[in-house]
Interface confidence: low
Amino acid sequence: NKILVKQSPMLVAYDNAVNLSCKYSYNLFSREFRASLHKGLDSAVEVCVVYGNYSQQLQVYSKTGFNCDGKLGNESVTFYLQNLYVNQTDIYFCKIEVMYPPPYLDNEKSNGTIIHVKGKHLCPSPLFPGPSKP
């Protein structure tokens, strides 16, 4: 039995930041779980992890240098990614594992979300007149 995951097909990170919501066909309340976000068609890069259990506060971390935070819902985890670079435009996949109570569950691979990172466009400074020359 597999958990189903829904993600937006595409998100645009205009300010180098984005909220990616992973919606599950499973209620995370009263469960020990590990939710993660993976980058690339082969999911080779684990971008961010949200780990929850009663014995400690919700843990959110990245071992791959991403600036991320996480928010837990009844049947969702939202990953907030900041300081994204244009070259990190890619497809991102949500993953969920439920470790307790048994049985161990994980998800069917989702369709993923293409995150398109738009570069910061710096507005030109207003022109101030320089010192007048004789």
Partner: nanobody, 122 residues
Framework: EVQLVESGGGLVQPGGSLRLSCAAS????????IHWFRQAPGKEREGVSC????????YYANSVKGRFTISRDNAKNAVYLQMNSLKPEDTAVYYC???????????????WGQGTQVTVSS
């Protein structure tokens, strides 16, 4: 004396409503996530709902989602569980408990109430 006290239980017909209260004395609830559990005869205790301390996020078990609503009133040092559309399978002793967080595994709670009986029967 530091304690949690539940109240509001009773006998109700199927489809009816009850409002349970969890009141604290000797300490303040606002620093804690508050859980409601229930235990029916011969069954394991199950988590019903929780409200977090930080942002008031609420969580519900599938069996009660859409029927039960948890809320807190920090001024009254109390947490409430509004139970609507009650079913016979909701019959149980309901307990509130304090914890640091709303999610997970270990069931390490600081304070427990003594429980209030809810019976749903025609």
């Amino acid at each position: 004396e530091v304690q949690l006290v539940e109240s509001g239980g009773g006998l109700v017909q199927p489809g009816g409503s009850l409002r349970l209260s969890c009141a604290a004395s000797g300490f303040t609830l606002d620093a804690y996530a508050i859980h409601w559990f229930r235990q029916a005869p011969g069954k394991e205790r199950e988590g019903v709902s929780c409200i977090s301390s930080s942002d008031g996020s609420t969580y519900y078990a599938n069996s009660v989602k859409g029927r039960f609503t948890i809320s807190r009133d920090n001024a009254k040092n109390a947490v409430y569980l509004q139970m609507n559309s009650l079913k016979p399978e909701d019959t149980a002793v309901y307990y509130c408990a304090t914890a640091k967080r709303c999610w997970g595994l270990s069931y390490e709670y600081d304070y427990w109430g003594q429980g209030t009986q809810v019976t749903v029967s025609s």
